[in-house]
């Protein structure tokens, strides 16, 4: 990682006068506690069209979106955080061919966190995007109670507890 | 905006903490606060960066071991820097990534000068 | 680790011209690249986020382009204030994130 050199640099002929540099002091809008809503900002240098996305080495593409598998585990929260420091988000499954795509790329039977978990302020299960679940798709067995977390394991998706040890999918 | 303090002339082996300075925000956000180096006459030098609320740290590969980097406050962030040689002489600045779903480092302290 | 290579380490054009500088990393970042302008005495100054994405304030005439592993910052219409040092830098999202920077090119406004 280290650099080469970068050259002192001048202008010839002229009056060359400095350009004002610009300073952005607006501060990033982050909810208090642990849990961190995504925000909108910058979402169009994510991705302008789903044929252009290219994702980084060791993360996988499916339907404009990359996806990166975990090898060790932790808990869901410090999961969350992982992904959050990596500009993504635990994952956010949309649909069963979604759902497939994951399963097919786990290629391991234990249970994995999503970006799902039961806030007892809303009392619902929400994803990381603040976003609901969709019943109509998904049905999580087990317990809908404060500090329960989502985790899939084929293709099936339970509630577990946050402070649990699993394995993790980020996404963006 | 962002400033950098403690920069000093060390003697060779020697020891120097940097700290710098938040105003107009504080640290007790989710930001990802980096440090990186310029020698005289040389290129940007990425030393390592960490995130004010989780404090988990990330470091070039070159830098680990003899940096560290901490947050010392709800506004400051310091480097710690140990076996100093002449090659650490350089200016170090700190930056602050102002993106959610990219890196934007927009925001930069004017440096602090280190001679070894 | 990943590597940023940049290239030239020098250019000149004339004013109102323009100037292209490549920026190469050793595997596919997507588009997880920032330009910036330093001039002697100056921190660095964000340009180009997210491969192509301007920052506030900054002319129309810095364009940023490219993803994976090759990327291009193209300064057009040169005016004298943009004699400067450029650096290219990469985000890699692996296991341990790592930020290098490029080695920097010198731009020569004639």
């Known amino acids: 990682l280290l650099v080469s050199q970068g050259v002192l640099l001048k202008c010839q002929k002229g009056s060359c006068s400095n350009a004002t540099q610009y300073e952005d002091t607006g501060d990033l809008k982050v909810n208090n506690g642990t849990r961190r809503n995504i925000s909108n900002k910058d979402l169009c240098a994510s991705r302008s069209a789903d044929q252009t996305v290219l994702c980084q080495s060791e993360w996988l593409k499916y339907q404009g979106k990359c996806y990166w598998f975990s090898n060790e585990m932790k808990s869901w929260s410090d999961s969350y955080v992982y992904c959050l420091e990596r500009k993504s988000h635990l994952l956010i499954i949309h649909d069963q061919l979604e759902m497939a795509f994951i399963q097919k790329n786990l290629r391991q039977l234990n249970y994995v966190w999503i970006g799902l978990n039961f806030t007892s302020l809303k009392m619902t299960w929400t994803w990381v995007d603040g976003s609901p679940i969709d019943s109509k798709i998904f049905f999580i067995k087990g317990p809908a109670k404060e500090n329960s977390c989502a985790a899939i394991k084929e293709s099936k998706i339970f509630s577990e507890t946050c402070s649990s040890v699993f394995k993790w999918i980020c996404q963006y | 905006s962002l400033e950098e303090s403690g920069g000093d002339l060390v003697q060779p082996e020697g020891s120097l903490t940097l700290t710098c300075t938040a105003s107009?925000?504080?640290?007790?956000?989710?930001?990802?606060i980096c440090w990186v180096r310029q020698a005289p006459g040389k290129g940007l030098e990425w030393i390592g960066c960490?995130?004010?609320?989780?404090?988990?740290t990330y470091y070039a590969s070159w830098a680990k071991g003899r940096f560290t980097i901490s947050k010392a406050s709800s506004t400051t962030v310091t480097l710690q820097m140990t076996t100093l040689t002449a090659a650490d002489t350089a200016t170090y600045f700190c930056?602050?990534?102002?993106?959610?779903?990219?890196?934007?480092?927009?925001?930069w302290g004017p440096g602090t000068l280190v001679t070894v | 680790a990943l590597v940023m290579t940049q290239t030239p380490s020098s250019v000149s054009a004339a004013v109102g011209g323009t100037v292209t500088i490549k920026c190469q990393a050793s595997q596919s970042i997507g588009n997880d690249l920032a330009w910036y302008q330093q001039k002697p005495g100056q921190p660095p100054k964000l340009l180009i986020y997210a491969a192509s994405n301007l920052e506030s304030g900054v002319p129309s005439r810095f364009r940023g382009s490219g993803s994976g592993t090759k990327f291009t910052l193209t300064i057009s219409d040169l005016e004298c204030a943009d004699a400067a040092t450029y650096y290219c830098?990469?985000?890699?999202?692996?296991?341990?994130?790592?930020?290098?920077f490029g080695g920097g090119t010198e731009v020569v406004v004639k």
């Open positions: 830098q990469g985000t890699y999202r692996g296991s341990s994130i790592s930020w290098p």
């Open positions: 960490i995130y004010s609320d989780s404090g988990n």
């Open positions: 930056a602050r990534d102002s993106g959610t779903t990219s890196w934007r480092y927009n925001i």
């Open positions: 107009g925000f504080s640290f007790s956000s989710s930001y990802c």
